[in-house]
Amino acid sequence: DTEIKVNPPQDFEIVDPGYLGYLYLQWQPPLSLDHFKECTVEYELKYRNIGSETWKTIITKNLHYKDGFDLNKGIEAKIHTLLPWQCTNGSEVQSSWAETTYWISPQGIPETKVQDMDCVYYNWQYLLCSWKPGIGVLLDTNYNLFYWYEGLDHALQCVDYIKADGQNIGCRFPYLEASDYKDFYICVNGSSENKPIRSSYFTFQLQNIVKPLPPVYLTFTRESSCEIKLKWSIPLGPIPARCFDYEIEIREDDTTLVTATVENETYTLKTTNETRQLCFVVRSKVNIYCSDDGIWSEWSDKQCWEGEDLSKKTLLR
């Protein structure tokens, strides 16, 4: 009864197609698979950024796999062949591991890369990224931003840079078609006559960095002798009402401050007949139903009522 063995996959490699972190892992079938012609061979692939504690594991019947990585760090991967029990008279058989690594040879010292990179997707319409030059770099240093997401044929360079003292310190992106709910990859590299500049890589999803416009059309409606309904409208733009959370700040008679977070465009406030003045502001944020994170909008213009009897039916400003 000879022990059944299988070889690891051949030619295992990590290929960089130039997508700024979205890499291809590919391999060829193991040698000597002739004994298992009737078998569907599977492969277990484990991979991670170097320094990460956990491996990501997948099983596939294919000879390739694609995923996103942080190119600021190296990547390590390993793969082995799996023979299901049907191939081997009831015992599972796995090969030894084939291993590979990939990293971009870093140029320049870490301090030369851009600092404080910040990207905001304004109102789910306009992406703007800004950064500060690296520490100690000379004025002849210029930075260039490239980006890619699935759907683009190749990485694109920013065409509308924000400049300060002749240096690129930000990018206004064009309309980004079908770019949300997928990884968005950015590389900011640089050039200088004097010294090499370290590249920086960033990955995020656009729906998670949205800063909406503030709500508009704030109004008051008296619901009863002790209740006032505050209302507002969603800001103009592509974000649907179901995607908003709101934070309200209400001030009564310059003293009482009420803060509340709500999901709808209304809030009912308990008041007393003695209330002489009422002011409120609202801001908006994309909620957990539409994103994993977000940025609060600026506060709306303040809406106040004062000087008249608050028992009047409708109070509009």
């Epitope: 569907t40 599977e42 277990e44 594991t57 997948i58 099983i59 596939t60 019947k61 294919n62 796999y65 299901p84 029990w85 049907q86 009831g90 015992s91 599972e92």
Partner: antibody, heavy 121, light 108 residues
Framework: EVQLLESGGGLVQPGGSLRLSCAAS????????MSWVRQAPGKGLEWVSS????????YYADSVKGRFTISRDNSKNTLYLQMNSLRAEDTAVYYC??????WGAGAFDYWGQGTLVTVSS | DIQMTQSPSTLSASVGDRVTITCRAS??????LAWYQQKPGKAPKLLIY???SLESGVPSRFSGSGSGTEFTLTISSLQPDDFATYYC??????????FGQGTKVEIK
């Protein structure tokens, strides 16, 4: 005849734990990968976890990773799912399923009758 | 993750009708696709595996076709016992194993 019989479901509070069992018969249990699949009330099927025949490899859905543990006792022909830190969204009928062909998962050719797990305070 | 999208979500048909359900994968899954039938309160039942292979004991009016990203389940002549919900499932690459959202076949 292949049979899979789940047990261990019930009502549990959020944050609580439960251990599901699946007793298998009618096939050579120790060589075959097994899986857990769940179905929330009125919803579709959601794969939860799989384990290879030898128990050497385990796989989990992101939604349960770190909270659920799949295991098996081949001497008892039994599959287990230990569920910790339960949440309301874990409420579902849990099915154990036999893998037709493959290392860790594949098409599921036999299913148990299911056991209902309700997470509520 | 590979997403599976079924259409239609609901299908109204009569006994004797030819019924086709479509399943689309977000990336190629070769022929690693299964179809299941589920009736209310019951466990799913495997109908088709490897996109087109009929599971033992399943009536021959059920058939599967397709490869890559587009797949279909066809019931050549709908029988009273066939009113149920049908799910597709990929097992090309995992985790996760992913299912379509289901297609309910109801009486017209």
């Amino acid at each position: 005849e292949v049979q899979l019989l789940e047990s261990g479901g019930g009502l549990v509070q959020p944050g609580g734990s439960l251990r599901l069992s699946c007793a298998a018969s009618g096939f050579t249990f120790g060589t075959i990968p097994m899986s857990w699949v769940r179905q929330a009330p009125g919803k579709g099927l959601e794969w939860v976890s799989s384990i290879s025949g030898s128990a050497g490899s385990t796989y989990y859905a992101d939604s349960v990773k770190g909270r659920f543990t799949i295991s098996r006792d081949n001497s008892k022909n039994t599959l287990y799912l230990q569920m910790n830190s339960l949440r309301a969204e874990d409420t579902a009928v849990y099915y154990c399923a036999k893998v037709r062909y493959g290392w860790g998962a594949g098409a599921f050719d036999y299913w148990g009758q299911g056991t209902l797990v309700t997470v509520s305070s | 993750d590979i997403q599976m999208t079924q259409s239609p979500s609901t299908l109204s048909a009569s006994v004797g009708d030819r019924v086709t359900i479509t399943c689309r994968a977000s990336q190629s899954i070769s022929s690693w696709l299964a179809w299941y039938q589920q009736k209310p309160g019951k466990a799913p039942k495997l109908l088709i595996y490897d996109a087109s292979s009929l599971e033992s004991g399943v009536p021959s009016r059920f058939s599967g076709s397709g490869s890559g990203t587009e797949f279909t389940l066809t019931i050549s002549s709908l029988q009273p016992d066939d009113f149920a919900t049908y799910y597709c499932q990929q097992y090309d690459t995992y985790p996760p194993i992913t299912f379509g959202q289901g297609t309910k076949v109801e009486i017209k």
